[in-house]
Amino acid sequence: YDFTNCDFQKIEADYLRTISKDLITYMSGTKSTDFNNTVSCSNRPHCLTEIQSLTFNPTPRCASLAKEMFARKTKATLALWCPGYSETQINATQAMKKRRKRKVTTNKCLEQVSQLLGLWRRFIRTLLKKQ
């Protein structure tokens, strides 16, 4: 999906109002220095591409963040403010329902969410630069 035509201001507002709080809650008990940020992004569409990938694509050591509250809110905000995004999720949602849910917060998942926080902050910064 090409995030170029999203309403970035509206996405930023949703992030600052609610998604950021859920990410921080997920990370509670860890320090910001516990993990190194290894994922970066260069512009707003690129940041959203990386955020989507890290939030919804399962990795071997962190099976699924997609059922977490911050992920559900991320999906909702992208569906709202990115033209045509929702239709790309119809098959993806059905596939996700078939996957077994295993809710274990591993250290690897915490590291992944730490990376997500960094990407979101980068997204906000690139937005401020544009303004």
């Epitope: 033209p83 929702s86 949602t93």
Partner: antibody, heavy 120, light 107 residues
Framework: QVQLVQSGDEVKKPGSSVKVSCKAS????????MHWVRQRPGQGLEWMGT????????DYNQNFKGRATITADKSTSTAYMELSSLRSEDTAVYYC?????????????WGQGTSVTVSS | EIVLTQSPGTLSLSPGERATLSCRAS??????VHWYQQKPGEAPRLLIY???QSISGIPDRFSGSGSGTDFTLTISRLESEDFAVYYC?????????FGTGTKVEIK
């Protein structure tokens, strides 16, 4: 089963306000946005706006911006649409409709409609 | 905003005939079009979503096709309960918009 039950019909004076409610049951309220659509007599459907409980945010059709306010009470699974500065052209049936925000993404259930008549 | 134009405005057909309803978008909207049926005094009812996806409980005589700017709702054999007004809707981008409507009436 999924149900959206709207408040009763209203007769209002020009310049006044109306607040229509839509009580949802049979599903998780925060998994869906609540949209409001109106239909003037003998006319088509017109999207007014939406409230997304999951994100605590709303969005409006520019034609209604400043006059329509869409809110929700998550504790009672009830959505509200308030329209102010009513004029005769606002005489219409007002519908609420749910729409999935993390799946389905379509208005798959509708309220029965609330008739609002604006007349002096 | 995206404008949806439906044609024809009215379709006069007999039961058993095939109905073909058209919906044209003012700009490409991929497959983000849904179809609703509305009978007098009732709320709209979802028939087809994302251009061609069927809904459980909706008779299979209703089918949808199209992508980009041109979409079609087909009723293969009209039954008496199918005479109603049909609307297309886009959810490609906000503000969501509805088509002008097509009335299918008994000839």
């Amino acid at each position: 089963q999924v149900q959206l039950v709207q408040s009763g019909d209203e007769v209002k004076k020009p310049g006044s306000s109306v607040k229509v409610s839509c009580k949802a049951s049979g599903y998780i309220f925060t998994d869906y946005a609540m949209h409001w659509v109106r239909q003037r007599p003998g006319q088509g459907l017109e999207w007014m706006g939406t409230f997304i409980p999951l994100l605590d945010t709303s969005d409006y059709n520019q034609n209604f911006k400043g006059r329509a306010t869409i809110t929700a009470d998550k504790s009672t699974s009830t959505a509200y649409m308030e329209l102010s500065s009513l004029r005769s052209e606002d005489t219409a049936v007002y519908y609420c409709a749910r729409m999935g925000v993390t799946h389905s993404y379509v208005m798959d259930a509708w309220g029965q409609g609330t008739s609002v008549t604006v007349s002096s | 905003e995206i404008v949806l134009t439906q044609s024809p405005g009215t379709l006069s057909l007999s039961p058993g005939e095939r109905a073909t309803l058209s919906c044209r978008a003012s700009q490409p909207i991929s497959i983000s079009v849904h179809w609703y049926q509305q009978k007098p005094g009732e709320a709209p009812r979802l028939l087809i979503y994302f251009a061609s996806q069927s809904i459980s409980g909706i008779p299979d005589r209703f089918s949808g096709s199209g992508s980009g700017t041109d979409f079609t709702l087909t009723i293969s054999r009209l039954e008496s309960e199918d005479f109603a007004v049909y609307y297309c809707q886009q959810t490609f981008s906000l503000p969501y918009t509805f088509g002008t409507g097509t009335k299918v009436e008994i000839k």
